[in-house]
Interface confidence: medium
């Protein structure tokens, strides 16, 4: 069982490989990689590219094998595949490999970009779309506006970006966005740089995060009604876990997306 010899796909179809709780996790999380074969198997192997021997074996007479990665470190991130085999197959013969599973072990998701489409200057009666773009698919995206503690709009996207439509009359202002994992544990990306939307003739500007002291942090203000929510420039979310890449439809998020928004 050193180098897997892969027969034609018609012989031994590929298994499915998934991660729980997530494909993106913070260091120290326990991750289970589940390999499910389309038929009962005898041995399962977990492979990383460039390594001739399986990283882990599981000898189980069933269709499912679980590989436990305890308290993962960034070094354990990367691409994984699994294969299965049966005792009646020839020596070293494995099934077709599963599709790749990329495990990312990191503290936070990368910063998204925030751009205005068609541009950051709004003409009379025109709407503007803000595109918050990250690097990962199936994330939930949150748009914030300076001076407003609650998220302005919220949506899940199968793409690595989400578009938020602002009505022309209400568009001018300073905006920022995050994206985050779609289900628990919820962890944020770094915040985008702020984007200023202005009326035609006023002139837009893009400002670095530190120069937007009025922008308020995500989350409700503290319970003390007189207290201020911290500014986004001082908000440093930590931690990151991405749940399985499946969108979740939700009943009624608060704040609710506009009626035209397919939403989350």
């Amino acid at each position: 069982d050193i180098t897997p010899s892969v027969p034609p796909a018609s012989y031994h179809p590929k298994p499915w490989l998934g991660a729980q709780p997530a494909t993106v996790v913070t260091p120290g999380v326990n991750v289970t990689l589940r390999c499910r074969a389309p038929q009962p198997a005898w041995r399962f192997g977990l492979f990383k590219p460039g390594e001739i021997a399986p990283l882990l074996f599981r000898d189980v007479s069933s269709e499912l094998a679980e590989f436990f990665l305890e308290e993962v470190t960034p070094a354990q991130g990367g691409i994984y595949r699994c294969c299965y085999r049966r005792p009646d197959w020839g020596p070293g013969v494995w099934s077709q490999p599963s599709d790749v599973l990329e495990l990312l072990v990191t503290e936070e998701l990368p910063r998204p970009s925030l751009v205005a489409l068609p541009g950051p200057v709004v003409g009379p009666g025109a709407n503007v779309s803000l595109r918050c773009a990250g690097r990962l698919r199936n994330m939930s995206f949150v748009l914030y506006r300076e001076g407003v503690a609650a998220p302005l709009q919220y949506r899940h996207s199968a793409q690595p970006w989400a578009d938020f439509t602002l009505l022309g009359a209400r568009a001018p202002g300073t905006y920022s966005c995050y994206y985050h994992t779609p289900s628990a544990p919820y962890v944020l990306s770094q915040r985008s740089e702020v984007l200023v939307i202005s009326w035609e003739g006023e002139g837009p500007e893009a400002r670095p995060a530190s120069s937007a002291p009025g922008m308020q942090a995500p989350g409700p203000p503290p319970s003390d009604p007189g207290a201020q929510a911290p500014s986004l420039s001082s908000f440093r979310p930590r931690g990151l876990v991405l749940q399985p890449l499946l969108p979740q439809t939700q009943d009624s998020w608060d704040p609710a997306p506009p009626p035209s928004d397919p939403g989350v």
Epitope: P21, Y154, S183, A184, G219, G239, P244, L246, T249, D254
Partner: antibody, heavy 118, light 107 residues
Framework: QVQLVQSGAEVKKPGSSVKVSCKAS????????ISWVRQAPGQGLEWMGK????????NYAQKFQGRVTITADKSTSTAYMELSSLRSEDTAVYYC???????????WGQGTMVTVSS | EIVLTQSPGTLSLSPGERATLSCRAS???????LAWYQQKPGQAPRLLIY???SRATGIPDRFSGSGSGTDFTLTISRLEPEDFAVYYC????????FGPGTKVDIK
């Protein structure tokens, strides 16, 4: 291991409000969701809504929209569920629950009995 | 909202027997978002199965879950005295909903 400890039983008059608390200990509070589920005597389970403390975003079941408010205080790792305009059919055990595995509820509070009676 | 129907409403069995509980959804549910809970009188529910087929931490292997789409099954291979309780299925891929429950009682 995360534990959820809820506030004590309440007796309320119809038309009033009740606020139940749920304190989390032993784990990361803000990056998880806290859901509220209720169970009327002899009945099944009914999901009311949830909050994601790190985002300050709430999600309510349509049935309770406008009558329930879920909040969280990250500094004390406590979530709150306030139900207003109480009626007798709101008499139930109210549970807070914490999803650690996908969004299934691994961890439950001990429950808070709320009785609505004139 | 997704409506879950459980059958039978009550299942009367003896210790050592096999219990098969059914949960049917009004529309397709991702198997990643289907869970089963056990509840005993006066106690909070206890998660048994998540993702349709994965056992939660500390759950004995006599409990197993299967199914996809709209039809899901919880099987208890050999009933132990402590297994007599009410069992709920739940979908949590959209606004979460629970089935009405199946009571497993001693024959």
């Amino acid at each position: 291991q995360v534990q959820l400890v809820q506030s004590g039983a309440e007796v309320k008059k119809p038309g009033s409000s009740v606020k139940v608390s749920c304190k989390a200990s032993g784990g990361t509070f803000s990056s998880y969701a806290i859901s509220w589920v209720r169970q009327a005597p002899g009945q099944g389970l009914e999901w009311m809504g949830k909050i994601i403390p790190i985002l300050g975003i709430t999600n309510y079941a349509q049935k309770f929209q406008g009558r329930v408010t879920i909040t969280a205080d990250k500094s004390t790792s406590t979530a709150y569920m306030e139900l207003s305009s109480l009626r007798s059919e709101d008499t139930a055990v109210y549970y807070c629950a914490n999803p650690l595995t996908f969004d299934a509820f691994d961890i439950w509070g001990q429950g808070t009995m709320v009785t609505v009676s004139s | 909202e997704i409506v879950l129907t459980q059958s039978p409403g009550t299942l009367s069995l003896s210790p050592g027997e096999r219990a098969t509980l059914s949960c049917r959804a009004s529309q397709s549910v991702s198997s990643s978002y289907l869970a089963w809970y056990q509840q005993k009188p006066g106690q909070a529910p206890r998660l048994l199965i998540y993702g349709a087929s994965s056992r939660a931490t500390g759950i004995p292997d006599r409990f197993s879950g299967s199914g996809s789409g709209t039809d899901f099954t919880l099987t208890i291979s050999r009933l132990e005295p402590e297994d007599f309780a009410v069992y709920y299925c739940q979908q949590y891929g959209s606004s979460p909903t629970f089935g009405p429950g199946t009571k497993v009682d001693i024959k």
